[in-house]
Amino acid sequence: PEPPTACREKQYLINSQCCSLCQPGQKLVSDCTEFTETECLPCGESEFLDTWNRETHCHQHKYCDPNLGLRVQQKGTSETDTICTCEEGWHCTSEACESCVLHRSCSPGFGVKQIATGVSDTICEPCPVGFFSNVSSAFEKCHPWTSCETKDLVVQQAGTNKTDVVCGPQDRLRA
């Protein structure tokens, strides 16, 4: 018979032969042959593999470094990685939660809608037309553009969400 060019799900092609993949939690020790099945071994302590695989090494569980404010939210198994979270009152810097911050800042162009608490991080909102923020801040709201008219001045440069308007003197008509 012709050697296969593709294999079924949970199999892989090697040496013109379809071998079974190792199940999650196990790593590949040796490929199958015409006479033997794929040989797999369970991952060791503090290791995991989360897919059907042909990996020869298991992945190390993530380390939740207390020096970065991290602690274990969910202990890893042979099939799952450890999930880290931040100490109470601190917030993850990313979905992967690789480090912690007291709170995040809102970038220029955004203002603080709600200051961070122990349970929720800073909530930012874009500065609407007529308002701006030119700083990165964890407490400052968007500021209204300066009203040139109330100072008897005219707008020389329009404001943006990151910059205030620039006011200047009105052109005087010469007599």
Partner: nanobody, 116 residues
Framework: EVQLLESGGGLVQPGGSLRLSCAAS???????EMWWVRQAPGKGLERVS?????????YYADSVKGRFTISRDDSKNTLYLQMNSLRAEDTAVYYC?????????WGQGTPVTVSS
């Protein structure tokens, strides 16, 4: 990397005053937003006060408004918190924090106890 060292805490009677300092080394605080945060025994972190990088804007938690004043002296690389009319509920460890507020910038804090 910035190191923050808080000082000035201690035991004070209700109605008394204290001035906390936060001295930075290894990096400047100039131009950076700064915060005072506290943690009372058995409680979570409470954000007390903040000051903008320019010093022109400040924030105070409702619980300290009118009693605490935040200030900065960038030439001394130091942040301050003047605490007046102290109450028992102000008892906590006080920490300062600098943008970007990462855990590894966190100081040891200075304990404040308000008791008669």
């Amino acid at each position: 990397e910035v190191q923050l060292l808080e000082s000035g805490g201690g035991l004070v009677q209700p109605g008394g005053s204290l001035r906390l300092s936060c001295a930075a080394s290894g990096s400047t605080i100039a131009g950076y937003e700064m915060w005072w945060v506290r943690q009372a025994p058995g409680k979570g972190l409470e954000r007390v006060s903040a000051i903008s990088g320019s010093g022109g804007s400040t924030y105070y938690a409702d619980s300290v408004k009118g009693r605490f004043t935040i200030s900065r002296d960038d030439s001394k690389n130091t942040l301050y918190l003047q605490m007046n009319s102290l109450r028992a509920e102000d008892t906590a460890v006080y920490y300062c924090a600098r943008d970007p507020y990462s855990f590894d910038y966190w100081g040891q804090g200075t304990p404040v106890t308000v008791s008669s």
